[in-house]
């Protein structure tokens, strides 16, 4: 604005005004008159750039006239009152309403004063994120999907993760004319380590006060990964019973555990209890390879463990699991 004291009347308005598709919006426009300055406003005019004629006129004596009377309204101008506020309300915003508008005051004796306002027509998108459940493929596949539906302008989608991964983003026209639906896929080579981890889809849009964060919990289907725990190489004759555990990670969950040995069925001193194997005390040395076979919907995997029960004083050793 000009510095105080220059005496000129000035039209004040924002350079840009946002409005939402289908909603109403007010284009603010005011005449700033310095103290002591006399001015007389005879007419307010709104025109759209590139179009001939005026879309809205408020005349001191004739009042308002509109190119589309059902969609336009001077919010403050009244007959018989000083015309200082030319603010115009637009109803039922359409995509084609986006553009540059000129607000003009006809003042005397200062002359016509105008300002340009850019009306931005926005549509607030709806955002969803979902997991893409995958199996171990050995190659990159979409593992998460984030969709921002019906935005204007198109939303910006980014992914945040410690796992790496690559985005693949595309857009198509939305249901409402002028809107855009943005789809972003998060792509990675599936592995069991990724299963259950989170990635975050960040959606940014002019209509949001802050970015929207949507968390996706990744799902990788994989056959069991099996190991046997509970043996520390220090088992001796005469010790109490010990327990071995068949540790299995899988998705979906294991459906069955089967214990055996390389020689066939379990020996009498070994008792299967689901994922656990109870080893009873023995009175002679043993050297046996135990097998745990775990099954889930995707298959079966097994782990082997060679167990030795040696002669020696149990009191000197502490590696065995006791009940």
């Amino acid at each position: 604005w000009p510095p105080p004291g220059t005496g000129d009347v000035v039209v004040q308005a924002p350079t840009q005004v946002p409005g939402f598709l289908g909603d109403s919006v007010t284009l603010p426009c005011y005449l700033q008159v310095p103290n002591m300055e006399v001015t007389h406003v005879s007419q307010l005019t709104w025109a759209r750039h590139g179009e001939s004629g005026s879309m809205a006129v408020f005349h001191q004596t004739q009042g308002p006239s509109y190119s589309e009377s059902k969609r336009l309204e001077f919010v403050a101008a009244r007959l018989g009152a000083e015309l200082r506020n030319a603010s115009l309300r637009m109803f039922g915003l359409r995509v084609e309403d986006e553009g540059n508008y000129t607000c003009l005051f006809v003042t005397f004796p200062q002359g016509s004063r105008s300002v340009d306002i850019w009306l931005r027509v926005l549509a607030k998108p709806q955002n969803t994120a979902e997991v893409q459940k995958v199996q171990l493929t050995g190659e990159p596949v979409p593992m998460a999907r984030c969709v921002s539906t019906g935005g204007r302008p198109p939303a910006q989608i980014t992914w945040h993760s410690d796992l790496g991964g690559m985005p693949n983003t595309s857009q198509v026209p939305g249901f409402l004319s002028g809107t855009v639906t943005v789809t972003s896929l998060w792509i990675l080579v599936p592995s069991s380590q990724v299963d259950g981890k989170n990635v975050t889809c960040k959606v940014e849009h002019e209509s949001f006060e802050k970015p929207q964060l949507l968390t996706v919990n990744l799902t990788v289907y994989y056959p069991p990964e099996v190991s046997i725990s509970g043996y520390d190489n220090n088992w001796y004759l005469g010790q109490n019973e010990a327990t071995l555990t068949c540790d299995a990670r899988s998705n979906p969950e294991p459906t069955g555990y089967n214990w055996s040995t390389t020689m066939g069925p379990l020996p009498p001193f070994a008792v299967a209890q689901g994922a656990q194997l109870l080893i009873r005390p023995v009175d002679k040395p043993i050297n046996t390879t135990l097998i745990c076979n775990v099954t889930n919907a995707l298959g079966a995997r097994q782990a082997e463990l060679t167990v030795q029960v040696k002669e020696g004083p149990p009191s000197e050793h502490s590696g065995i699991s006791r009940n």
């Epitope: 007389h40 004596t61 018989g80 005397f108 002359g111």
Partner: antibody
């Protein structure tokens, strides 16, 4: 054709009042700003007041507040100026002028021929 | 009230460029004074030439132009013609009233 037709010369006595008229044609009167100016013989111009014909809104030179009163009659597209408590100092030619717009600014566009007022006892 | 001062008389020759100025007693003339220029020819024939400092009225020859030069308003006639011989008044706006200058008698010899 745009015209401002002013009333004829007036010879008036000190202390009296006079009402000058300015009949317009050829333009939209109700959207017009009309100023009244004073010119003493061989001297410069002095602005008295303006009026917006559409509403009758006025603005006066402080010097003439209480001395001059400007009005309009939209039905006849005529502007008036009444001068009261006349003295010999008020002897002058009085012009009505329609302001025209260049878009960005206003100018003194259409001038009446002037009305000579002589104040004499 | 402010006093507006103009050259009392100027002489120029046909085809020459002449500049008339308009000074304000209150300080520099600015665009917020909306300087007007009016031409008076014999028999009180008035023509508005310029409004709002530099806006030429419709129908006024392009040789007439308004501007601000230094702290004054100016009317420049580029290529004066004999018919430009007249008295030229400037008028300045002071927030709520116009003040006219004393006029410049321009002679084109």
């Amino acid at each position: 054709q745009v015209q401002m037709q002013q009333s004829g010369a007036e010879l008036v006595k000190p202390g009296a009042s006079v009402k000058l008229s300015c009949k317009t044609s050829g333009f939209t009167f109700s959207s017009s700003y009309i100023s009244w100016l004073k010119q003493k013989p061989g001297q410069s111009l002095e602005w008295i007041a303006w009026i917006y014909a559409g509403t009758g809104d006025t603005n006066y030179n402080q010097k003439f507040t209480g001395k001059a009163q400007v009005t309009v009659d939209t039905s006849s597209s005529t502007a008036y100026m009444q001068f009261s408590s006349l003295t010999t100092e008020d002897s002058a030619i009085y012009y009505c002028v329609r302001h025209g717009s260049t878009g960005r600014g206003w100018y003194f566009a259409v001038w009446g021929a002037g009305t000579t007022v002589t104040v004499s006892s | 009230q402010a006093v507006v001062t103009q050259e009392s008389a100027l002489t120029t020759s046909p085809g020459e460029t002449v500049t008339l100025t308009c000074r304000s007693s209150t300080g520099a003339v600015t665009t917020s004074n909306y300087a007007n220029w009016v031409q008076e020819k014999p028999d009180h024939l008035f023509t508005g030439l310029i409004g709002g400092t530099n806006n030429r009225a419709p129908g006024v020859p392009a040789r007439f132009s308004g501007s601000l030069i230094g702290d004054k308003a100016a009317l420049t006639i580029t290529g004066a013609q004999t018919e430009d011989e007249a008295i030229y008044f400037c008028a300045l706006w002071y927030s709520n009233h116009f003040v006219f200058g004393g006029g410049t008698k321009l002679t084109v010899l």
